[in-house]
Interface confidence: medium
């Protein structure tokens, strides 16, 4: 059913009456409608609601509503539905962000690193190396670095100091009468902390930009998402580096080397001399699906002198 509607601050548009050649000034139709009949010398203009699958965003003097963008391509989801007032807008699902017209998973900050800035639908996660007194013992795209457990507040002592990757291990003071036991809920990591390489068991989720490779040859892995690891510091477990982080360091080049150690394979991420990592600018504009209809519509982006 047609509707004669208009907005409160309605504008006007010019229309040439084909019958008389006269230039008429007609009231625009409101957003969500279009001009189904132009005004004449003897009638007001008539507005009709946009049919399903079409829209007009603004008051307008156009004769046909715009086609909505096509359904969101996987893995995108609808942020705004196609409706009389709005075009369909696509966005990335939770845990992903817009990258090159598709969605990429948020960067997983590696062990020893925490989330500095949460990821959004348009921006990747930004990671930072855990500062002194904090640690991150799990790869995560959502968790920040956690503060060390305060052993003293629990009337315990630090049996093993925390690192960027591990919490303090608390325990009672050693005595000859009883064996040392860590406090509940804490873990003891017996393996040496002073390793030149970061060992990542193959079952571990490897952060983007630290991908493993199946071949035996070395492969340089430097996708642009590494640019999301901010602060310019290098994941580093060496005791010499801890506590005096060099914020001017750029990201390392990473090489994945398959070492065979006994019956288990391990992916060892070696830090190579760094090259500057740069990242492309990420658009914050909503993603649209491709348009239906005449290709010229993309060119004009729905601009119509009678619509603005």
């Amino acid at each position: 059913q047609p509707e004669q509607k208009a907005s409160n601050l309605i504008g006007t548009y010019r229309h040439v009456d084909r019958a008389t050649g006269q230039v008429l000034t007609c009231d625009k139709c409101p957003a969500g409608t279009y001009v189904s009949e132009h005004c004449t010398n003897t009638s007001l203009r008539v507005c009709s609601s946009c049919p399903v699958g079409t829209f007009t965003r603004h008051e307008n003097g156009i004769e046909k509503c715009h086609d909505c963008s096509q359904p969101c391509p996987w893995p995108m989801i609808e942020k705004l539905p196609c409706a009389a007032l709005t075009d369909r807008e696509c966005t990335c699902p939770p845990g992903m962000f817009q990258s090159n017209a598709t969605c990429a998973p948020h960067t997983v900050c590696p062990v020893g690193w925490g989330v500095r800035k949460k990821g959004t639908e348009t921006e990747d996660v930004r990671c930072k190396q855990c500062a002194r007194g904090t640690f991150s013992d799990v790869p995560s795209s959502v968790m920040k670095c956690k503060a060390y457990t305060d052993c003293l507040s629990q009337n315990l002592v630090v049996i093993k100091p925390g690192t960027k990757e591990t919490d303090n291990v608390c325990g009672t003071l050693p005595s000859f009468s009883s064996s040392t036991s860590p406090s509940p809920g804490t873990a003891i990591f017996p393996r040496p902390e002073h390793m030149e390489t970061h060992e990542v068991p193959s079952s571990t989720y490897v952060p983007k930009g630290m991908n493993s490779t199946e071949s035996n040859s070395s492969a340089s892995v430097r996708p642009k998402v590494l640019s999301s690891i901010q602060e310019g510091t290098v994941p580093d477990n060496t005791s010499s580096a801890r506590g005096k982080e060099d914020v001017n360091k750029t990201l390392p080049n990473l090489q994945v080397v398959n070492h065979q150690q006994g019956p288990h394979h391990r992916h060892i991420l070696k830090l190579l001399p760094s090259m500057e990592a740069t990242g492309g600018e990420k658009s914050s504009t909503p993603i649209k699906g491709p348009k239906r209809g005449h290709p010229r519509q993309n060119l004009h982006k729905h601009f119509d002198i009678n619509e603005h």
Partner: antibody, heavy 117, light 106 residues
Amino acid sequence: EVQLLESGGGLVQPGGSLRLSCAASGFTFSEYTMHWVRQAPGKGLEWVSVISSSGGRTVYADSVKGRFTISRDNSKNTLYLQMNSLRAEDTAVYYCARDLSNYMDYWGQGTLVTVSS
Amino acid sequence: DIQMTQSPATLSLSPGERATLSCRASQTVSNYLAWYQQKPGQAPRLLIYDASNRATGIPARFSGSGSGTDFTLTISSLEPEDFAVYYCQQRSKWLSFGGGTKVEIK
């Protein structure tokens, strides 16, 4: 529910003035063109005037042109008809009506204007 | 101005009968024509717009036809509540109503 309620009618002497009001509710008044239509006792319907939703465009029937003024206050959801130089032939029930593509889809119950000495 | 002429002025019929009302324009109005129903003491009600489209909530027994200058409103089987006055209205050149047709019980 769409409702239109006219008021302001009454007895007036020829040459006198009267201002009719139409209070609208149940819809976004500022988005609709509105009409006044009248009906003389025992007679048919006669279209009087129309005003665009913004109030920017008004049109009148020849019989009232120059004497009647249609207006609206969108902040008050109210339509008005200022009637001057009233004549006996203006005696009628005056209806306000909401526009649907230059037809009328909702009507008030009307207010009676009697012009008599 | 466009004059609208309705005929007959009065139509006497019984419930269940078919009613055919006519409306003629003094010049072509394309299909820009509506039909209204008015009962005594009540405001008019829109039945048909653009010659043949039923307005919201109008029963299917009401139908409209015609274009140009000649139009017809048909009530396929009269119900007791259909006895009323019917008006046509054009919107081709501003707005004007016909004089009305009264449908009364015979």
